[in-house]
């Protein structure tokens, strides 16, 4: 029988009546066009909904938009279009919501052709009131908030000017012209690239990288011959053109661009690309594209300085620049990432790492599941996960994999069981241990979301027909109840729940279609009465993450420490609540060679934990570029993995001697940098 259809499944008592009393319908009094939804702040219950409708006329397009606001998690909405003077809002800019709980919102309006500049509507009280502001420029991008100060905004204009506001968009100042890309760094720093000879595209590879730490009063050129740049964790990356040819290399800085080191990564040609897949304050995952139109490349993981890289995964699926990759950070368990590889026969397979890229393996075949037609051996196969690539290929996959930091261990994804990803209709699988083991959760494709930190999982079948049924589980997807939320089925368009998975409200969005009209409609269901009581100590059990062999003294050790968590028992039907904080207890592990990566000039042979010297470097002095100087490295081949907390045990020694010579291969040496003030 399908999951949840066993008679033994514990049924939640009287749930139909409880949910019926907590189901709120809202019909939006406008024609169906597009709808976008944004949450304003955390735990505020404020949602903004923007509906837009385009009517193509003979010469131009007539547009109409409406703005709605809810302050009870979507149970009721109020039309507040009059607060923005019934102005048409440009959906391509979305709603720019301020960081944290600032309550700030910026909407960018459509203006008539001949106007001097654009127009924005600003709110700093969670969209209760808006102020109209006319801009001295036409915006090219959405307003970007400084992560440190939500009063500081930056935007690029259609004329490639970099504009900054220090008073939440009230007054704007152009601080630089000829800007291609701008990003906020830490401490209200702005990094941006500029062109000299005409355009961003024409100057690609000859751009300059600039920095301002005082919102445009003074500037420093921190890089030349720049192709592009990116920020990840505490690292600033720039891809820089080589002097002699059309190749480029990655340089990295950990001091906001004052000093640079060349990353020990392969250079790439014109048709190739680099991509930061994930980064934190400890390390970075970098994808380096393979030459030719292969659709794959190599993942490298960095050391703690972002300079020395270890090869992590070959044949990593990543279509052209800005294309699709399935690389997914499993946020519900430390160190876990899932992605896809393109095998020699062009089939796509899913790989998982539990130790931040140290080793990759196939996903374990779910218990009680059969291998599909892609499997050569019907008894041996793996689970393969559908992610961005499958969605881009228009497979019947409505959602990417889902995990939440506060729903420890839970991962939900569409997948198939075989030797490779299948084009057949997928099922939904769940892992409760961060990806080590999997179970089929639902038959066929579904939309799904996590509520109350994992206390409830909600799902809706993906169907081309109108729907009126929602499924929910209170035991991490083992058993399912179905609830008919409306008599009249709707064409379903999406599930919306507050980011962070702490809410107990879910909104089902869709439209109704009658003979002449079609209207947006939302149903918001509050599950608070299903989880009647607050969870107590007895509702939780202790769980050791990353446990694979209890007889191993270091069982559960990943990156030098193990973590025990208090997890909700599957049988407990209670509220974790909004204030739920994951309870965990770390224990430091003894160091082993697994806690070290191979240093510059060393590599690990397959299935070996020892680092050996690269044959081509044997007997040579190891000299490499660091902070624009040449360094001499005395090493026995090991460097501690970033973020690894192990103590004691094995301890390989390492020493770096400064040769005090300038690094000729470093295109971003400090000598080439200059400063200027406005």
């Amino acid at each position: 029988s399908a999951p949840g259809e066993d008679e033994e499944c514990g049924r939640v008592r009287d749930f139909v009546a409880k949910l019926a009393n907590n189901t709120h319908q809202h019909v939006f009094d406008d024609l169906r066009g597009s709808v976008s939804l944004s949450w304003v702040g955390d735990s505020t219950g404020v949602i903004l909904v923007l509906t837009t409708f385009h009517v193509p006329l003979v010469i131009m397009t007539f547009g109409q938009s409406k703005l709605y606001r809810s302050e009870d998690y979507g149970k009721n909405f109020k039309d507040i279009t009059d607060l923005i003077n019934n102005t048409f809002i440009r959906t391509e800019f979305g709603m720019a919501i301020g960081p944290e709980n600032s309550g700030k919102v910026v909407l960018t309006a459509e203006v008539s052709g001949g106007s001097r500049g654009g127009r924005i509507f600003r709110s700093s009280d969670f969209a209760k009131n808006f102020v109209q502001t006319d801009l001295p420029f036409h915006p090219l991008t959405q307003m970007m908030y400084s992560p440190q100060n939500s009063d500081y905004l930056l935007a690029l204009s259609t004329e490639n000017g970099l504009w900054v506001s220090k008073n939440f968009g009230g007054k704007w100042e152009e601080i630089h012209k000829a800007v291609c890309l701008a990003k906020w760094g830490s401490d209200n720093t702005i990094f941006f690239t500029t062109y000299a000879n005409g355009s961003c595209k024409a100057d690609l590879g000859a751009l300059e990288l600039w920095r301002t730490s005082d919102l445009g009063k003074s500037f420093k050129t921190i890089g030349v011959k720049i192709y592009s740049f990116g920020l990840g964790g505490r690292f600033l990356f720039a891809s820089v053109m080589a002097d002699k040819d059309t190749t480029r290399r990655i340089h990295v800085s950990t001091d906001q661009g004052d000093t640079w080191s060349m990353a020990q990564l392969p250079s790439v040609g014109q048709e190739q690309f680099y991509s930061i897949l994930a980064a934190n304050d400890d390390m970075v995952f970098m994808h380096v594209d393979e030459p030719g139109d292969t659709g794959f490349g190599t993942i490298f993981t960095s050391d703690d300085r972002g300079i020395v890289y270890s090869k992590s995964l070959d044949r990593h699926l990543y279509t052209t620049t800005g294309g699709e990759t399935d690389f997914t950070n499993v946020t519900s368990l430390r160190g876990v990432y899932i992605t896809s590889v393109l095998s020699e026969d062009n089939s796509i397979q899913t790989m998982i790492t539990f130790d931040q890229g140290g080793r990759w393996t196939h996903l374990r075949k779910p218990e009680n599941s059969e291998c599909d037609a892609t499997a050569k051996n019907k008894n041996e196969c793996s689970l393969h996960i559908h992610a961005s690539y499958s969605i881009s290929q228009k497979l019947n996959v409505p959602m990417a994999p889902l995990s939440e930091p506060n729903a420890v261990g839970i991962v939900i994804a569409h997948g198939s069981v075989g030797d490779a990803i299948s084009v057949m209709v997928p099922d939904v699988y769940i892992s409760d241990d961060g990806g080590y083991s999997w179970t089929k959760m639902l038959e066929g494709p579904h939309y799904y979301t996590i509520l109350d930190s994992g206390g409830i999982i909600v799902a809706i079948e993906h169907s081309s027909r109108p729907i009126n049924v929602i499924k929910f589980s209170t035991d991490e997807g083992q058993c399912w109840q179905t609830y008919t939320f409306t008599r009249d089925p709707i064409y379903f368009t999406g599930l919306a729940s507050e980011p962070g998975a702490r809410s107990m409200n879910i909104s089902i969005w869709g439209f109704t279609e009658s003979f002449l009209t079609s209207q947006w409609v939302s149903y918001t269901i509050d599950f608070k009465d299903i989880l009647e009581r607050n969870c107590e100590e007895k509702d939780y059990t202790i769980w050791l993450a990353h446990s694979t062999d209890p007889e191993d003294y270091e069982d559960g050790c990943i990156l030098g420490y193990k973590e025990q968590f208090l997890r909700l028992r599957k049988s407990s039907v209670c509220q974790n609540g909004r204030d739920y904080v994951v309870t965990k207890q770390p224990s430091i592990c003894l160091c082993s060679l697994e806690d070290f990566l191979c240093d510059f000039g060393y590599y690990r042979p397959e299935n070996d934990s020892k680092c050996v010297e690269q044959p081509e470097l044997k007997g040579h002095d190891l000299e490499f570029c660091l902070y624009g100087r040449e360094e001499h490295l005395t090493t026995n081949g090991y460097r501690k993995i970033p973020g690894d907390k192990c103590q004691g045990g094995v301890n390989p020694v390492r020493e770096v001697k400064d040769l005090k010579k300038k690094c000729t291969s470093n295109f971003l040496s400090p000598e080439k940098q200059n400063s200027k003030s406005n």
């Epitope: 083992q478 050791l544 191993d552 025990q564 049988s571």
Partner: antibody
């Protein structure tokens, strides 16, 4: 082969406390929870609580909360159960048992190794 | 706490008989149930974990089934060594045991 060896029989007065030890040998003590289970004469089994030696995370049955303290010493691979405010109803055989473990969950797979039991008699 | 109700409390059977003991949980415990055998003056011995998984070294005549709230321990052909008291134990709440079933010679 894992073994759990418990301390010897005890005779106690009402109102006093008793501390029973349980020493593990031949296995990875730190990675398994140790439960304490008692059995009054002619009665069934009753779980009192348990501890995970690594980190010392203990939890107790509601009935014994406040009266029982379970501890573990990783260096000697020994778990302890102390029961205070003893009364005659506490007369029983007290067992320590290792919670079997196949995954990260410490308490879900039954108790696969048991101590020989310690008889505690409470009498005035 | 979750209550475990075991039945029957006593069972008379002969060698070679097929014996079935049931255990009911007061709420769903998924498959988190263990069965033990205890002989007088001895510590209990684990037979079955996770409702149906046989502990290593336990004869295959013992089997467990069920999930949710209803569970069964079956001895397919009773042997002389099997006369003992059997306990079920749930592990999905604070641990609780059933009251026990004494299997005696008919």
């Amino acid at each position: 082969q894992v073994q759990l060896v418990q301390s010897g029989a005890e005779v106690k007065k009402p109102g006093s406390s008793v501390k029973v030890s349980c020493k593990a040998s031949g296995g990875t003590f730190r990675n398994y929870a140790i439960s304490w289970v008692r059995q009054a004469p002619g009665q069934g089994l009753e779980w009192m609580g348990g501890i995970i030696p690594i980190g010392g995370w203990a939890n107790y049955a509601q009935k014994f909360q406040g009266r029982v303290t379970i501890t573990a010493d990783e260096s000697t691979s020994t778990a302890y159960m102390e029961l205070s405010s003893l009364r005659s109803e506490d007369t029983a055989v007290y067992y320590c048992a290792r919670q079997g473990r196949k995954t990260g969950y410490y308490y879900y797979y039954g108790m696969d190794v048991w101590g020989q039991g310690t008889t505690v008699t409470v009498s005035s | 706490d979750i209550q475990m109700t075991q039945s029957p409390s006593t069972l008379s059977a002969s060698v070679g008989d097929r014996v079935t003991i049931t255990c009911r949980a007061s709420q769903s415990i998924s498959s988190w149930l263990a069965w033990y055998q205890q002989k007088p003056g001895k510590a209990p011995k684990l037979l079955i974990y996770k409702a149906s998984s046989l502990e290593s070294g336990v004869p295959s005549r013992f089997s467990g089934s069920g999930s949710g709230t209803e569970f069964t321990l079956t001895i397919s052909s009773l042997q002389p060594d099997d006369f003992a008291t059997y306990y079920c134990q749930q592990a999905d709440g604070h641990i609780t045991f059933g009251g026990g079933t004494k299997v005696e010679i008919k």
